[in-house]
């Protein structure tokens, strides 16, 4: 048995890192291997994450993290029953994948403007809190050449746009994603996509 | 505002015990690692111990390994040194601090106001 | 275990005068460092934190620089409150570790 990908981590800097790699072969991830994971500092505790399949040569491990803070440093080892197959260590505020925001809803009672309105996925007590920046990725559903981002580059989860701007008649949906600047972190996962329609009509003298 | 009262100090002779009290308030304690800061009288700053905010991780000083032990008490509000064996050296002031993010354990934008530890016979 | 050490361990600067302390790691930190102030008798002050981040309610004359190893605490116009001792600080690994300090006194 042998890793043909090493595993890549990345953190949510809160509780939990996501660990993915590539085996040489088919492998029932679960049934065959497991990540050790242990703090780097004195003798703290060793902590065991069973893998799941992420397709047919790929796994993905969810690790459980005693609150993550910019200190820690973990050690990584990969083990099929009692063969080591891969020995590595992971900072995980050096690889921080921020949560997906959450939430996302449109408002269109007001007349010429889309509202958009979304949740930061992370607690106010936390520093990625006042941190992230935002994409909102809007579509047309019935024509994908039609789509455009928008980038929330202030700290308010909101974005407004005319209505004008969007097709009459047409079904629009959104999706929006986070990254982090300080951190300089990847892009979040997308949000679950809303969708809503797009009711606006021009004003009979400017038609 | 963030308030943390440190209490317990005294005066112990060498191999003794005391335990330490930080009383908190003004956020949410939860959420938050906390740690032990001394300073030797006329000296800088050492760092004793952090437990972690859901107290599932402690971490301590080489100097006072199995020796102290950090704990908390989440619905007290109350953070807890236990230092056990004590040595002169370990006469300081103690401080209880909080760091300024959930997510961060070193950037102590709270500190109480300190008790002080005197080991001697 | 990495090592924090500061320089000059004292100095004595006039009111008005820009003043700077550094801070070497003995291994790449980042930019994972705070700065403190201890006035005699009293608890210490956060003032910078990420290196370069003035906390808040912390005049703007004093500031931080630096990432990696080498780091400085600069104080643009010395006032008389600014007499105390300073601490540099890293984590960005365990254990946590200070600075030796540096006592700043007023000519």
């Known amino acids: 048995m042998k890793v043909l990908q090493e595993p890549t981590c990345v953190s949510d800097y809160m509780s939990i890192s996501t660990c993915e790699w590539k085996m040489g072969g088919p492998t029932n991830c679960s049934a065959e291997l497991r990540l050790l994971y242990q703090l780097v500092f004195q003798s703290s505790e060793t902590h065991t994450c069973v893998p799941e399949n992420n397709g047919g040569v790929g796994c993905v491990c969810h690790l459980l993290m005693d609150d993550v803070v910019s200190m820690d440093n973990y050690t990584l080892d990969l083990w099929a029953g009692q063969q080591l197959l891969w020995k590595g260590s992971f900072k995980p505020s050096e690889h921080v994948k921020p949560r997906a925001p959450g939430n996302l809803t449109v408002h269109t009672n007001v007349s010429d403007t889309v509202l958009l309105t979304w949740s930061n996925p992370y607690p106010p007590d936390n520093y990625l809190y006042n941190d992230l920046t935002y994409a909102v990725n809007i579509w047309n559903e019935n024509d994908l050449a039609d789509s455009r981002i928008h980038n929330v580059t202030y700290l308010k989860p909101t974005l407004r746009i005319p209505a004008s701007t969007l097709k009459s008649g047409i079904s629009y949906r959104a999706r929006v994603r986070a990254w982090a600047q300080h951190y300089n972190t990847t892009w979040s996962e997308w949000s679950p996509s809303t969708k809503w329609y797009n009711s606006y009509r021009e004003p009979f003298e400017q038609r | 505002q963030v308030q943390l009262q440190e209490s317990g100090g005294g005066l112990v002779q060498p191999g003794g015990s005391l335990r330490l009290s930080c009383a908190a308030s003004g956020f949410t304690f939860s959420s938050y690692s906390l740690t032990w800061v001394r300073q030797a009288p006329g000296k800088g700053l050492e760092w004793v111990s952090t437990?972690?905010?859901?107290?599932?991780?402690?971490l301590y000083a080489d100097s006072v390994k199995d020796r102290f032990t950090i704990s908390r008490d989440n619905a007290k509000n109350t953070l807890y040194l236990l230092m056990n064996s004590l040595k002169p050296e370990d006469t300081a002031v103690y401080y209880c601090?909080?760091?300024?993010?959930?997510?961060?354990?070193?950037?102590?934008?709270?500190w109480g106001q300190g008790t002080t530890v005197t080991v001697s016979s | 275990d990495i090592q924090m050490t500061q320089s000059p361990s004292s100095l004595s600067a006039s009111l008005g005068d820009r003043v700077t302390i550094t801070c070497q790691a003995s291994q790449s930190i980042s930019s994972y460092l705070a700065w403190y102030q201890q006035k005699p008798g009293q608890a210490p002050r956060l003032l910078i934190y990420g290196g370069s981040r003035l906390q808040t309610g912390v005049p703007s004359r004093f500031s931080g620089s630096g990432s990696g190893t080498s780091f400085t605490l600069t104080i643009s116009g010395l006032e008389t409150e600014d007499l105390a001792t300073y601490y540099c600080?890293?984590?960005?690994?365990?254990?946590?570790?200070f600075g030796q300090g540096t006592k700043l006194e007023i000519k």
């Open positions: 437990i972690k905010a859901r107290g599932g991780t402690t």
């Open positions: 601090v909080k760091p300024l993010y959930s997510n961060f354990a070193g950037d102590f934008g709270s």
């Open positions: 600080q890293q984590d960005y690994s365990w254990p946590l570790t």
